[in-house]
């Protein structure tokens, strides 16, 4: 089981619609053909899995139908988008990359991206 470097931005601000995107880049030591990408959320020292996808190199990144994540891959970069975020979802989002095939197995864990989510102010009632 070998270690691998994973880079991701330190901070991202979600849009007013609760969408946050960031790039997760890994330093692949070889030509991996099966890669697993997982997004984890760390808040108050608790870690939970947000979403995960396994993809074959050259194919689309496919998350489960009910996932709040979407993504695309290009070489050793994965572009991740998380939707439906609210202020309470603010936290550290960690990108984990596993090179499943061919052997040897590699695991890389990023330092995390702090995603800030600000709920939009409700529109004031209008007399017009």
């Amino acid at each position: 089981c070998k270690a691998m470097h994973v880079a991701q931005p330190a901070v991202v601000l979600a849009s007013s619609r609760g969408i946050a995107s960031f790039v997760c880049e890994y330093a692949s030591p070889g030509k991996a053909t099966e890669v697993r990408v997982t997004v984890l959320r760390q808040a108050d020292s608790q870690v939970t899995e947000v979403c995960a996808a396994t993809y074959m190199m050259g194919n689309e990144l496919t998350f489960l139908d009910d996932s709040i994540c979407t993504g695309t891959s290009s070489g050793n970069q994965v572009n991740l988008t998380i939707q439906g975020l609210r202020a309470m979802d603010t936290g550290l989002y960690i990108c984990k990359v596993e090179l499943m095939y061919p052997p040897p197995y590699y695991l890389g864990i990023g330092n995390g991206t702090q995603i800030y989510v600000i709920d939009p102010e409700p529109c004031p009632d209008s007399d017009f």
């Epitope: 053909t33 099966e34 984890l40 984990k96 095939y101 061919p102 197995y105 695991l107």
Partner: nanobody, 119 residues
């Protein structure tokens, strides 16, 4: 607690066959690379065959065309079918699961099963 339990080893004549089975407990089966390793006396533990969650399969050159690895998701079992066995296949065979759970890497091993190929 995760357990990997191997079975199916034994004594077989050259040219014979054996079927090794590894039963995995816990929720490791679908998320991890499952493999078979072997270790002969005085040697290091070497990867024989592995299968990924996506179905990609690896074989060491020394067993290609003779060994077949497969997984039964319903039974959480990994099978190593060994045909045309040779005396140099004699070793202790270990089932392995490697991957990660949240932020922790995992590398589970079974207790091993002895395979002896001799006339």
């Amino acid at each position: 607690e995760v357990q990997l339990v191997e079975s199916g080893g034994g004594l077989v004549q050259p040219g014979g066959s054996l079927r090794l089975s590894c039963a995995a407990s816990g929720n490791i089966f679908t998320r991890n690379v499952m493999g078979w390793y072997r270790q002969a006396p005085g040697n290091q533990r070497d990867l024989v065959a592995s299968i990924t969650p996506g179905g990609n399969i690896y074989y060491a050159d020394s067993v290609k065309g003779r060994f077949t690895i497969s997984r039964d998701g319903a039974k959480s079992t990994v099978i190593l079918q060994m045909n045309s066995l040779k005396p140099e296949d004699t070793a202790v065979y270990y089932c392995n699961a490697r991957g990660s759970i949240l932020l922790d890497r995992v590398n589970y091993w079974g207790q091993g099963t002895q395979v002896t190929v001799s006339s």
